[in-house]
């Protein structure tokens, strides 16, 4: 009779993570008597996957009933496959011996490859806000995929970016891989509504590439422009001075009026108007009773935006240009929350 051969018909098997792998093995003879064992890898460091005779292997089931006397099918199924299960599996026939069974013949091996989807890309931006014209870095990370081949693209508002660096780790063979990419983006004043998108494509993805996004509204700071103007006289001896705070983002803003360098009033931006580009406008106004002043008045609108150093704009109020009421140095009534009389 011909000597027993161990046949592993599949040179390679490909399985998706989470699925079940079937590793086929048949023997050509019932002789010699002895068990079958499955190993991952060869040599002294090989890992026992299944032992027909003894042991507990919860993820492994046999395709056939190995207790049947004439069984020659030693195929196994391994459940809930992960990338860590990748490797070459050997079906090994042992000859019954005393005290230990002796390895008799091994199959040629079946290489198990595992395909695993990349995790959803996570995009993160800089810790601190930056202003237009500055370059900021965004990072994108995705993990757990196999095989290693993957493509990553960056977009800003649908336009592909070219200034980025990508690494897939580890460099050598591994059960699964991670990708890390850093893109440089130049901010513009119009970027409040902009989005940065990281797009990852992999062989396992049946849909479009996976996308991770970051809103530039969380990254950008658009400093305000200030304009202080003197409005036409509202009533005799009264001048309305306004401070237009334009095109700022985010909304966090505090405004202080100074009269000849002295603090007159401080207020926080509340009822702002939003521009189409996502920036905000706000206006504060001051009612000045010029009859209370003998000299010219320097009015300063000082704005502290998003915790940054204050910016200011001044306006000189020419008192001489207004006829004064003799002996009048009392203030006009405060007529609104945004009105302030200067004494």
């Amino acid at each position: 009779e011909e000597e027993l051969q161990v046949i592993q018909p599949d040179k390679s098997v490909l399985v998706a993570a989470g699925e079940t792998a079937t590793l086929r093995c048949t023997a050509t003879s019932l002789i010699p008597v002895g068990p079958i064992q499955w190993f991952r890898g060869a040599g002294p460091g090989r890992e026992l996957i299944y032992n027909q005779k003894e042991g507990h292997f919860p993820r492994v089931t046999t395709v056939s009933d190995l207790t049947k006397r004439n069984n020659m099918d030693f195929s196994i199924r391994i459940g809930n496959i992960t990338p860590a299960d990748a490797g070459t599996y050997y079906c090994v026939k042992f000859r019954k011996g005393s005290p230990d069974d002796v390895e008799f013949k091994s199959g040629a091996g079946t290489e198990l490859s595992v395909r695993a989807k990349p995790s959803a890309p996570v995009v993160s931006g800089p810790a601190a806000r930056a202003t237009p014209q500055h370059t900021v870095s965004f990072t994108c990370e995705s993990h757990g995929f196999s095989p290693r081949d993957i493509t990553l693209k960056w977009f800003k508002n649908g336009n592909e970016l070219s200034d980025f660096q990508t690494n897939v780790d580890p460099v050598g063979e591994s059960v699964s891989y991670s990708i890390h990419s850093t893109a440089k983006v130049v901010l513009t004043r119009e970027d409040v509504h902009s989005q940065v998108i990281c797009e990852v494509a992999h062989v396992t993805l049946q849909g479009d590439p996976l996308r991770g996004t970051a809103n530039l509204s969380e990254t950008i700071r658009v400093p305000p422009t200030l304009e202080v103007t003197q409005q036409p006289v509202r009533a005799e001896n009264q001048v309305n001075v306004t401070c237009q705070v334009r095109k700022f983002y985010p909304q966090r803003l505090q405004l202080t009026w100074l009269e000849n360098g002295n603090v007159s009033r401080t207020e926080t931006a509340s009822t702002v108007t939003e521009n189409k580009d996502g920036t905000y406008n706000w206006m504060s106004w001051l009612l000045v009773n010029v009859s209370a002043h003998r000299d010219d008045v320097k009015l300063t609108c000082q704005v502290e935006h998003d915790g940054q150093p204050a910016v200011s704009k001044s306006h000189d109020l020419k008192v001489s240009a207004h006829p004064k009421e003799q002996g009048s140095n009392t203030a006009a009534e405060n007529t609104g929350s945004n009105e302030r009389n200067i004494y």
Epitope: K11, S12, L14, V15, A16, E111, S113, R115, P147, D149, I150, T151, A201, H202, V203, T204, L205, Q206, G207, D208
Partner: antibody, heavy 115, light 109 residues
Framework: SVEESGGRLGTPGTPLTLTCTVS????????MGWFRQAPGKGLEYIGI?????SPYYASWVNGRFTISKTSTTMDLKMNSPTTEDTATYFC?????????????WGPGTLVTVSL | DIVMTQTPSSVEAAVGGTVTIKCQAG??????LAWYQQKPGQRPKLLIY???TLESGVPSRFKGSGSGTDYTLTISDLESADAATYYC???????????FGGGTEVVVK
């Protein structure tokens, strides 16, 4: 299974739409592709549509074909056929393990474009 | 686009013999290569994917191998039913596009 329909004798310049009908699986779970084979020639890739409905085309297509889908069918519109487009058109589904191969093919539908 | 060069265009072998078909990619395709069998008037049938993985139900007489740019389909113990045209097909993970080889006609004597 997948099956193509709509193949017929057409005239140059007159749009023609082929339909691929699937059963036993959902188009929302798999990438689907269109291929063609001119008489006596080899297989040629036209384009795919992703599970979410985005089409991707071979570089030579240049607007000559449009791929779209509904919940159970995928269409290939020949926008302005020429005699060179005479071929058997196949639709196919990618494998469950990845988009690098096609494991389910239709029997094909013959399109003849003639003056 | 990647060009797939398949050789030979035609091969003849006897029943029980062995046939080897080669496919060369214009650049590395990282084992993303499939082999199909097509008989006249029929649809293509997937034999092998990811260079060497046998599709379910396909006899182990069909063997795929190779990596990088060079791939091989070996059919051993030829049967008359193996008479067909065989195509290789690549997928390029960067361009996410597909390409076919020109085909090899296998004649079984």
């Amino acid at each position: 299974s997948v099956e193509e329909s709509g193949g017929r004798l057409g005239t140059p310049g007159t749009p023609l739409t082929l339909t691929c009908t699937v059963s036993g699986f959902s188009l929302s779970s798999y990438v689907m592709g269109w291929f063609r084979q001119a008489p006596g020639k080899g297989l040629e890739y036209i384009g795919i549509i992703s599970s979410s409905g985005s089409p991707y085309y071979a570089s030579w297509v240049n607007g000559r074909f449009t791929i779209s889908k509904t919940s159970t069918t995928m269409d290939l519109k020949m926008n302005s056929p020429t005699t060179e487009d005479t071929a058997t058109y196949f639709c196919a589904r990618v494998g469950p393990l990845g988009v690098d191969y096609f494991n389910i093919w239709g029997p094909g539908t013959l399109v003849t474009v003639s003056l | 686009d990647i060009v797939m060069t398949q050789t030979p265009s035609s091969v003849e072998a006897a029943v029980g013999g062995t046939v080897t078909i080669k496919c060369q990619a214009g650049q590395s395709i990282n084992s993303y290569l499939a082999w199909y069998q097509q008989k006249p008037g029929q649809r293509p049938k997937l034999l092998i994917y990811y260079a060497s993985t046998l599709e379910s139900g396909v006899p182990s007489r069909f063997k795929g191998s190779g990596s990088g740019t060079d791939y091989t389909l070996t059919i051993s113990d030829l049967e008359s039913a193996d008479a067909a045209t065989y195509y290789c097909q690549s997928w390029h993970y960067i361009s996410r596009s597909y390409a076919f080889g020109g085909g090899t006609e296998v004649v079984v004597k």
